[in-house]
Every structure is written in structure tokens, then in C-alpha cells.
């Protein structure tokens, strides 16, 4: 009899999510009878966020009652496989990666939520979820078909300090420019109106009706 399990996980993700509880129940009940292997399911494709963070769920149908599980994320590129991160956890406890690991994760039953941080465009590739039931014996190995993670580097964004310096420089420049402009304008005006200018007051004809016998003075500059 063929080994019943998750074949290539190419179904739409929403469909996989909807049918998963039933599938998991089926495997938990029947795998010990049909197949002495562990099967691991993970999404086919994930797009990393603009901050270089990618998250995906790794689920496994366990053929045994393990108390100690090891989860490893592998990256496959050009048939070369490298370890990205690994964590061992006791069932019911939290998944803990090493402090310097680029991975974080949480576990819930036979499901592990994995997050990989610090990804760049060059890190685009196939990320394989490997699950090992370490204890008690027998040991079981489960390898997922991999999640293709696409990472797109954002346009280089200058940091806030740099922006502040630019803003300060532009503001200062504008201030000095306006100050200079004002100074030049004032100096031109002052040159036009010399302090030695003399003039005479003359009586002008009335601008108001005849009844008002008032005269308006008018200053006439004499060059």
C-alpha cells in the first residue's frame, strides 16, 4: 500500500487551511496503520515583508507520541542544503531558538509557527521545514517539500538622523538666503534714499471742496 501522506503541497493555501483539521485528524488516526513515516506540510510560497521578515506554518502528522521534538529550517539552493536555524522543544513547552538565531517560533500541538528575520533579496530560496521526533524511541524524520520565500529589497531609505541633517541644512540655507536677500534689498533702497537729500514745502492747491480752507503739505525731493 502506498504511503498516504501530504504529497507536494500545491493546493491553494486557503483551501489547505480549511481542510487541515480533518486531514490532521485522519492522519493521526490512520498513519500508524498505513505508514511508518512522518509527513510535514508547509506553504508553497511566502513573500517576505519589506522589513525582511517571513513567516510560515510547519505542520506535521506524528506517527508516534513524541515528548521531544526538534525543528530545523534548511535552505536549499542549487542542490546545496544549509541549516538556517534549529530548535528542540518539549511537547507543551515553547519553542526556543538560540539567542543569535535569525529564527523565532511558537509551537502549538503538531504545528510550529516559524518566523525568519533579517532576510535580503539574496536570501530568496527554498526553505525546508525538517521535523524530528527525538524522544522517546523510535526516532522519526519528517521533511517538508519546502516554502519558496521571495525577498525583495526595499528602495534604500535614509535613516532619520540623516533626514534631520538634510532638513537642518536646507532650513539654514533658506534662512541665510532670505537674510541675504533682505540685506541686499535694504542696501539698494538705502542707496536710493540718501540721508543728505534736501527739499521744500510748498502750498498745494486744495484737493477738498472750496469750503475747506486747509492746505495739504507735500514733500518734493530736490536732486
Amino acid at each position: 500500500m502506498a504511503c498516504l501522506g501530504f504529497q507536494r503541497h500545491k493546493a491553494q493555501l486557503n483551501l489547505a487551511t480549511r481542510t487541515w483539521p480533518c486531514t490532521l485528524l485522519f492522519f493521526l488516526l490512520f498513519i500508524p496503520v498505513f505508514c511508518k513515516a512522518m509527513h510535514v506540510a508547509q506553504p508553497a510560497v511566502v513573500l517576505a515583508s519589506s522589513r525582511g521578515i517571513a513567516s510560515f506554518v510547519c505542520e506535521y502528522a506524528s506517527p508516534g507520541k513524541a515528548t521531544e521534538v526538534r525543528v530545523t529550517v534548511l535552505r536549499q539552493a542549487d542542490s546545496q542544503v544549509t541549516e538556517v536555524c534549529a530548535a528542540t522543544y518539549m511537547m507543551g513547552n515553547e519553542l526556543t531558538f538560540l539567542d543569535d538565531s535569525i529564527c523565532t517560533g511558537t509551537s502549538s500541538g503538531n504545528q510550529v509557527n516559524l518566523t525568519i528575520q533579517g532576510l535580503r533579496a539574496m536570501d530568496t530560496g527554498l526553505y525546508i521545514c525538517k521535523v524530528e521526533l527525538m524522544y522517546p524511541p523510535p526516532y522519526y524524520l519528517g521533511i517538508g517539500n519546502g516554502t519558496q520565500i521571495y525577498v525583495i529589497d526595499p528602495e534604500p531609505c535614509p535613516d532619520s538622523d540623516f533626514l534631520l541633517w538634510i532638513l537642518a541644512a536646507v532650513s539654514s540655507g533658506l534662512f541665510f538666503y532670505s537674510f541675504l536677500l533682505t540685506a541686499v534689498s535694504l542696501s539698494k533702497m538705502l542707496k536710493k534714499r540718501s540721508p543728505l537729500t534736501t527739499g521744500v514745502y510748498v502750498k498745494m492747491p486744495p484737493t477738498e471742496p472750496e469750503c475747506e480752507k486747509q492746505f495739504q503739505p507735500y514733500f518734493i525731493p530736490i536732486n
Epitope: 502506498a2 504511503c3 498505513f34 505508514c35 509527513h39 541549516e83 534549529a86 528542540t88 525538517k130
Partner: antibody
Framework: QVQLVESGGGVVQPGRSLRLSCAAS????????LHWVRQAPGKGLEWVAV????????HYADSVKGRFTISRDNAKNTLYLQMNSLRAEDTAVYYC???????????WGQGTMVTVSS | EIVLTQSPGTLSLSPGERATLSCRAS???????LAWYQQKPGQAPRLLIY???SRATGIPDRFSGSGSGTDFTLTISRLEPEDFAVYYC?????????FGQGTKVEIK
């Protein structure tokens, strides 16, 4: 260069003990499961034992359980197999092998011969 | 324990011929966890195929693996003089790790 080199084999009387060593180089030792596999003269391959990563988990073949102990020293990049209460049927070439990240035995040592004879 | 049975025990062929080796499991093995090894006299085994069909690093493309469930096959498309050796299949999905008894490919 990834390499495994076994040592410690020899001729020993039934009921006696022997310790095999396997020195590893060229890879991150603690990231891999390490196995001992043996091959009796003119026979096929038989898996003997495995030790995982930090050494906290070990599994043995039924034929050696209770007599053989697998251990590792990650600081020295060395794998060991302590063989007690040896029997004539334990006569074989003993290989250490590194499990690949995807599970198969991708790197093997050259082997060391253990002969149990009175 | 998963028992692997290889056939034939010995295969007598000439260089340039096609070799087909069979490995049958006592119970279903996921194709992700089946490997093939080559062993020459006085040497350690060498990994040829893992995951039933993926060639290991440096293995020529005349070697190919296939199969699923309980039946697996190793095919050598054109035998070269250096291919005459003993071939073992192995399952590594669960403990105990088990090997087939081997198929010897000899020169006719």
C-alpha cells in the same frame, strides 16, 4: 575538507571491551547526527547506533542494546563507541557516518576492523 | 522494523548496458526517506541517491532513482567499468535505520 577518521579497532577476546573513536573535521560537528554502521566480513551493512546533536538523545540497534554506548565530545569533534561484552558476531568493519541535513548518510569514514576471537 | 529486500542478488552485465536494481520494503516508505549507496571492495559505502530520486553531490547523471510506497528502483543507464560494485538501498525515515542485503553488479 569534510572527513571522518575511525580508530581503535583490533583483536579482542569475547566478553572483553573496546572503544572506537571517530575524529571529524571540515564541518560544524554539533549540527549533525552521527551514526555507527558495521559490516561483517562478506555481509551487508548493519546500522548500530546514532547520537544526536548535543548528545542527549541516542538510539541503538536491538542487537547491541545494553552492551554498546555511543557518545560524542563536541568540543573535540569526536564520536565514540564503547563496546562491552563483545561477542564473535560483533566481528565487523565499523564505520562512522554523518547523517545529511536531509537524513541520508552522506559522509563515511574509512572504517576500522574489530575482530572478536578467542 | 522496516525490512528492505533487494533483487536480484547478483546482476551480470557488460559495460555500456543498462542496469536496473530493485528494492522492496516490507511496509510503505515515504520516497523522501530512501537512499541508494555504492560500495566497492575494501572501501566505505558512497551515497548515490537520496530522497528516492535526488542525486548526491558529484554523482554522474547515468545514475537515477525512482519509485514510491514499497517499490524503488536504481537505474544505471550505461554501465561504466567503475560502476561494477555492490549497491545497497536504505530507509532513514524512522529508527532503526535499515539497509537492503545488497545487489552485486558484476562484469559478464
Amino acid at each position: 575538507q569534510v572527513q571522518l577518521v575511525e580508530s581503535g579497532g583490533g583483536v579482542v577476546q569475547p566478553g572483553r571491551s573496546l572503544r572506537l573513536s571517530c575524529a571529524a573535521s571540515g564541518f560544524t560537528f554539533s549540527s549533525y547526527g552521527l551514526h555507527w554502521v558495521r559490516q561483517a566480513p562478506g555481509k551487508g551493512l548493519e546500522w548500530v547506533a546514532v547520537i544526536w546533536y548535543d548528545g542527549s538523545n541516542k538510539h541503538y540497534a536491538d542487537s547491541v542494546k545494553g552492551r554498546f554506548t555511543i557518545s560524542r565530545d563536541n568540543a573535540k569533534n569526536t564520536l565514540y563507541l564503547q563496546m562491552n561484552s563483545l561477542r564473535a558476531e560483533d566481528t565487523a568493519v565499523y564505520y562512522c557516518a554523518r547523517g545529511a541535513l536531509l537524513g541520508a548518510f552522506e559522509i563515511w569514514g574509512q572504517g576500522t576492523m574489530v575482530t572478536v576471537s578467542s | 522494523e522496516i525490512v528492505l529486500t533487494q533483487s536480484p542478488g547478483t546482476l551480470s552485465l557488460s559495460p555500456g548496458e543498462r542496469a536496473t536494481l530493485s528494492c522492496r520494503a516490507s511496509q510503505s516508505v515515504s520516497s523522501s526517506y530512501l537512499a541508494w549507496y555504492q560500495q566497492k571492495p575494501g572501501q566505505a559505502p558512497r551515497l548515490l541517491i537520496y530522497g528516492a530520486s535526488s542525486r548526491a553531490t558529484g554523482i554522474p547523471d547515468r545514475f537515477s532513482g525512482s519509485g514510491s510506497g514499497t517499490d524503488f528502483t536504481l537505474t544505471i543507464s550505461r554501465l561504466e567499468p567503475e560502476d561494477f560494485a555492490v549497491y545497497y538501498c536504505q530507509q532513514y525515515g524512522s529508527s532503526p535505520w535499515t539497509f537492503g542485503q545488497g545487489t552485486k553488479v558484476e562484469i559478464k
